[in-house]
């Protein structure tokens, strides 16, 4: 937590080495949270369409305890769409990102919760 999940039809072979690390570093910069709390999950090779086309696309989610809101989400979108375009060659207009502001009591970690 923060937790970023990317579902994409881009094949596994097209996901560059270091992509998970780069996502982690950039989310740490953007959220101000240490990398040890950031989880990323890239799910390639998915059967997907966006706008009726099977060109590269991504359906994503970012869960965080706080640090979610209008201006912040726009910043995250710029960052994450940029990374997906730069590294996976996915056009930003073929990306959806859902943002979830989690209650600390509803996030389990290390035998307990963050509450």
């Amino acid at each position: 937590m923060p937790m970023f999940i990317v579902n994409t039809n881009v094949p596994r072979a097209s996901v560059p080495d270091g992509f998970l690390s780069e996502l982690t570093q950039q989310l740490a910069q953007a959220t101000g949270k240490p990398p040890q709390y950031i989880a990323v999950h890239v799910v390639p090779d998915q059967l997907m369409a966006f706008g009726g086309s099977s060109e590269p696309c991504a359906l994503c989610s970012l869960h965080s305890i706080g640090k979610i809101g209008g201006a912040q989400n726009r910043s995250y979108s710029k960052l994450l769409c940029g990374l997906l375009a730069e590294r996976l060659r996915i056009s930003p207009d073929r990306v959806y990102i859902n943002y979830y502001d989690m209650n600390a009591a509803n996030v389990g970690w290390n035998n307990s919760t963050f509450a």
Partner: antibody
């Protein structure tokens, strides 16, 4: 080793513009945010805001919205602070500081002293 | 905005004594099982230097005489024992929320 080197002292008149540079070396510039901190003579530290070095997006503290602008030249690993329409009360030392993950400031520039006087 | 209140504003100690500086915040700076509170030392004419990050972690190269403690709204920087080189102003800073804010500073004089 990691270094942040700022441009030299500035003497300006009210109404003028100043651009202060902060050149980073020794680390991957785009992986860490860059902050700007002001310190008027004899006073404490005040966070002015930060710039995301990957997206180039600036965030300004309320007291520094309007005349202040952060920018980057990522190819030169350099961050800039521009202050327009200078006022006497802008007289201060301005520091750049790298955000480590967790937003603490682990490396600082040496500071740039700005004096605004007619 | 989160307000940080440092106390005392100044203190004068003899060599070998223990310095205790307090920083209280107007709301909790804890999240994700961490406290987003940090401490800096600034000497006249110099830039600030990071001492302690995330409340209790000693920055690399900082002597073990420095330690940090606390959580939520109450934090402490301790220097034990103080040395002549510790004469400086000390600032706390929170980064749990923007704007990132500093305390007003505590000036330490060594007698």
């Amino acid at each position: 080793q990691i270094q942040l080197v700022q441009s030299g002292p500035e003497l300006k008149k009210p109404g003028e513009t100043v651009k202060i540079s902060c050149k980073a070396s020794g680390y991957s510039f785009r992986n860490y945010g860059m902050n700007w901190v002001s310190q008027p003579p004899g006073k404490g530290l005040e966070w002015m805001g930060w710039i995301n070095t990957y997206t180039g997006e600036p965030t300004y503290a309320d007291d520094f919205k309007g005349r202040f602008a952060f920018s980057l030249d990522t190819s030169a690993s350099t961050a800039y602070l521009t202050i327009n329409n200078l006022k006497n009360e802008d007289t201060a030392t301005y520091f750049c500081a790298r955000s480590n993950y967790g937003n603490y400031f682990d490396y600082w520039g040496q500071g740039t002293t700005l004096t605004v006087s007619a | 905005n989160i307000v940080l209140t440092q106390s005392p504003a100044s203190l004068a100690l003899s060599l070998g004594q223990r310095a205790t500086i307090s920083c209280r915040t107007s709301e909790s700076v804890d999240s994700y099982a961490s406290s987003f509170m940090h401490w800096y030392q600034q000497k006249p004419g110099q830039s600030p230097k990071l001492l302690i990050y995330l409340a209790s972690n000693l920055e690399s190269g900082v002597p073990a005489r420095f330690s940090g403690s606390g959580s939520r709204t109450d934090f402490t920087l301790t220097i034990d024992p103080v040395e002549a080189d510790d004469a400086a102003t000390y600032y706390c800073q929170q980064s749990n929320e923007d704007p990132r804010t500093f305390g007003g500073g505590t000036q330490l004089e060594i007698k």
